[in-house]
Structure formats: structure tokens, C-alpha cells
Interface confidence: low
């Protein structure tokens, strides 16, 4: 005896209640081999992990791990996370143009330096990819008497904690 | 030789999780779907959930909020957790495998498990 | 889920008896239905598959037969190696779900 399920194809289930008919996967639910009676849930891309193919009739989502992000607009593949002096953008990483720094690994944007002048201060250690500068005391805190500056830490985006 | 055998701890205190482990050998855990199976001892058969070659599950309604099937492919291992035992879960535990054609055409020799504490 | 039903709950019969084991589904389940075989060892194998099918290496004196809701396993002719219990599993749908078995004995 052939089993009638046998022909329902990938995309399908063999639908018990009504006498066999292939019928179409539910949404959010696939079958990738034919004859099956019942169609698989797709996998949702939680916690840590994104979505890097949606789920389609015939296949189940791809995840991408914790350390990778989705590349394009259907996730079509996993990219390694950006690292400090890179920023994410709609092509991947991409480099801090000069002038701009990203201290954070994984997250954030590409930030301009600090602009030490506008605060009067002298620039003490130049700006990196992945550093701002470091401003140096303003000409009035050299004066006779006055005590040690300890540089300003570099700025950072609100709600992000320190690496 | 397709062969599949459970490996479990025996006996497991009441309220704990349980933990067996099904090895695979002669057959791809890719291409075969993989049952466990149950039997209370003097009773019948029980199906407990089964895990397709794609990785999900589906699993007893009345047991689902305690159980747990994974798989690692590369181990060809298939494990089941059930968790808050009573000594209801008292059986035998077997894993079997699940063909295209949807019966189990090989078992494990199956692994007892005692709850008492 | 659905429910199965095996009648007798054990049998005892003579060797060279035909013996009959009955499965009933508590609703239509088309001819997705399996009987196994689990001998006193624990050891359980596949005998019919698809109603009627017989597996591979299973002696041709077991047959099955039925549809929708009543199924039967069939020895033609008991031999001392079928003491064993008998069980009939569908697989119309999730979850899957066995009968109570049949506890076969030779008198």
C-alpha cells in the first residue's frame, strides 16, 4: 500500500482531517522534507540570538550567535560584531572616519573627537579610532599654585558602562 | 548496525530532574527523528516526546511543562530531561528511532529509572 | 490526543493456535497505525508498520488489518518465541500515542 502522504512535498503537510489533502505550512511553520504529517514550528531568534534567515514554508530560521549580527535587510548572513574604532552600518563595519572614535566593542556609533579648544585646553594625548583625545590643562591652570589636572576621562554615550 | 543505547543515573531523589542521554551509532540524528518512550513497571508504553532531524521537539501535552529533548548532532546523542520527579516517573526509559515512514524500527534496550528518596 | 484501546488485556493460547489481538482508536486515525512486539527481556522491536505492512525480518505468520478505528493483529499459527506483549501505536497525530498492550502466554 502507498502511503498517500508520500506525495505531499516540502512546504506541506499531510493533512489528516482532510483526507490526506497536502495542505500549505500554517504560518511560522515549515516542513523541509516531503510526506510529513505535521508541519515543524520555526525557530525563534531570541536572548542572544538574531534572526539571520527567516523562516520560509520549506526551511527554519537561522540564528545568529552572541558576537555576530545580521548583514542585510533579510539577514542573509552572520557578521562578526564591530569591533572599537568601527561603527555598524546597513553594509557591516565600517572604519571611524578620521576625526571620530568608537570606544565600544560590539555597540555604538563613530563620535567625534572632544574639541579641547572650545574649552580653552591644549590637546594632551591625540584622538585614535577607537580613543578621543585627551585634553591637557588650560593655560590658566599652569599658573604658580595651582595643583595637578587629571585628565577627563573620555566621553561616553549615555547607558553604556565602562569595558 | 544501527544501534541505540540510553545511558541514565538509576536512581533519581523526588523533586530532582532527571538526565539520560541517548547514544546514536550507525545512523545520522540529521536524517532520523528520535522517540523517547516510557513504561512504569507492570504497565504499558508511554510516548514522551520526540525530536526531529531538524531539532524541534514535540512532546506529551501532559508532560510538556517538565520535559526537555535536545540533541547534538555531532555526538549523535539525544538527551531528556524531565524535571520535579515523582515516583510516578518511576520506569523504564527507551529512546527509539523514528523513520521517514513514522514508526519506530529501532530501540534502545532502555535504562531504568527509580525515583525514591 | 487520541486513545487507544487493545483487547485482551492477556490471552493464553496453545502453540499452533491462530490468536487475534484487537486495537480500537478513539477516533478515525486512516491507517496510521503500528503493533510492536516487546518480548519478557524488555527487548521491543517492529513488527507492522502502516496497518498491515510487515516490517523487515518479521515472520510472515503475523498480519495485520482494519481502518479508521478498529484494527487487528493476526499470528496464524503461535510459535514459543511470540510469548511476549503486543502494543498498537498511531501515528495520525501528535502525540503519538500507544494501546495498553496484550500480554500473549502459551498454555
Known amino acids: 500500500l502507498q502511503d498517500p502522504c508520500s506525495n505531499c512535498p516540502a512546504g506541506t503537510f499531510c493533512d489528516n482531517n482532510r483526507n490526506q489533502i497536502c495542505s500549505p505550512c500554517p504560518p511560522n511553520s515549515f516542513s523541509s522534507a516531503g510526506g510529513q504529517r505535521t508541519c515543524d514550528i520555526c525557530r525563534q531568534c531570541k536572548g542572544v540570538f538574531r534572526t539571520r534567515k527567516e523562516c520560509s514554508s520549506t526551511s527554519n530560521a537561522e540564528c545568529c550567535i552572541e558576537g555576530f549580527h545580521c548583514l542585510g535587510p533579510q539577514c542573509t548572513r552572520c557578521e562578526k560584531d564591530c569591533r572599537p574604532g568601527q561603527e555598524l552600518t546597513k553594509q557591516g563595519c565600517k572604519t571611524c572616519s578620521l576625526g571620530t572614535f568608537n570606544d565600544q566593542n560590539g555597540t555604538g556609533v563613530c563620535r567625534p573627537w572632544t574639541n579641547c579648544s572650545l574649552d580653552g585646553k591644549s590637546v594632551l594625548v591625540n584622538g585614535t579610532k577607537e580613543r578621543d583625545v585627551v585634553c591637557g590643562p588650560s593655560p590658566a591652570d599652569l599658573s604658580p599654585g595651582a595643583s595637578s589636572v587629571t585628565p577627563p576621562a573620555p566621553a561616553r554615550e549615555p547607558g553604556h558602562s565602562p569595558q | 548496525q544501527v544501534q541505540l543505547q540510553e545511558s541514565g543515573p538509576g536512581l533519581v531523589k523526588p523533586s530532582e530532574t532527571l538526565s539520560i542521554t541517548c547514544t546514536v551509532s550507525?545512523?545520522?540524528?540529521?536524517?532520523?527523528?528520535v522517540h523517547w518512550v516510557r513504561q512504569p513497571p507492570g504497565k504499558g508504553l508511554e510516548g514522551l516526546g520526540v525530536i526531529w532531524p531538524g531539532g524541534s521537539t514535540n512532546y506529551n501535552s501532559a508532560l510538556m511543562s517538565r520535559l526537555t529533548i535536545s540533541k547534538d548532532n555531532s555526538k549523535s546523542q539525544v538527551s531528556l530531561k524531565m524535571s520535579s520527579l515523582t515516583a510516578a516517573d518511576t520506569a523504564m526509559y527507551y529512546c527509539?528511532?523514528?523513520?521517514?515512514?513514522?514508526?519506530?524500527?529501532?530501540w534502545g534496550q532502555g535504562t531504568t529509572v527509580t525515583v525514591s528518596s | 490526543d487520541i486513545q487507544m484501546t487493545q483487547s485482551p488485556s492477556s490471552l493464553s493460547a496453545s502453540l499452533g493456535d491462530r490468536v487475534t489481538i484487537s486495537c480500537s482508536a478513539s477516533q478515525g486515525i486512516s491507517n496510521y497505525l503500528n503493533w510492536y512486539q516487546q518480548k519478557p527481556d524488555g527487548t521491543v522491536k517492529l513488527l507492522i508498520y502502516y496497518t498491515s505492512t510487515l516490517h523487515s525480518g518479521v515472520p510472515s505468520r503475523f498480519s495485520g488489518s482494519g481502518s479508521g478505528t478498529d484494527f487487528t493483529l493476526t499470528i496464524s499459527s503461535l510459535q514459543p518465541e511470540d510469548v511476549a506483549t503486543y502494543y498498537c501505536?498511531?501515528?495520525?497525530?501528535?502525540?503519538?500515542?500507544f494501546g495498553g498492550g496484550t500480554k500473549l502466554e502459551i498454555k
Open positions: 550507525g545512523s545520522s540524528l540529521t536524517s532520523y527523528g
Open positions: 527509539a528511532r523514528v523513520t521517514g515512514t513514522w514508526y519506530f524500527d529501532v
Open positions: 501505536q498511531q501515528y495520525s497525530k501528535l502525540p503519538w500515542t
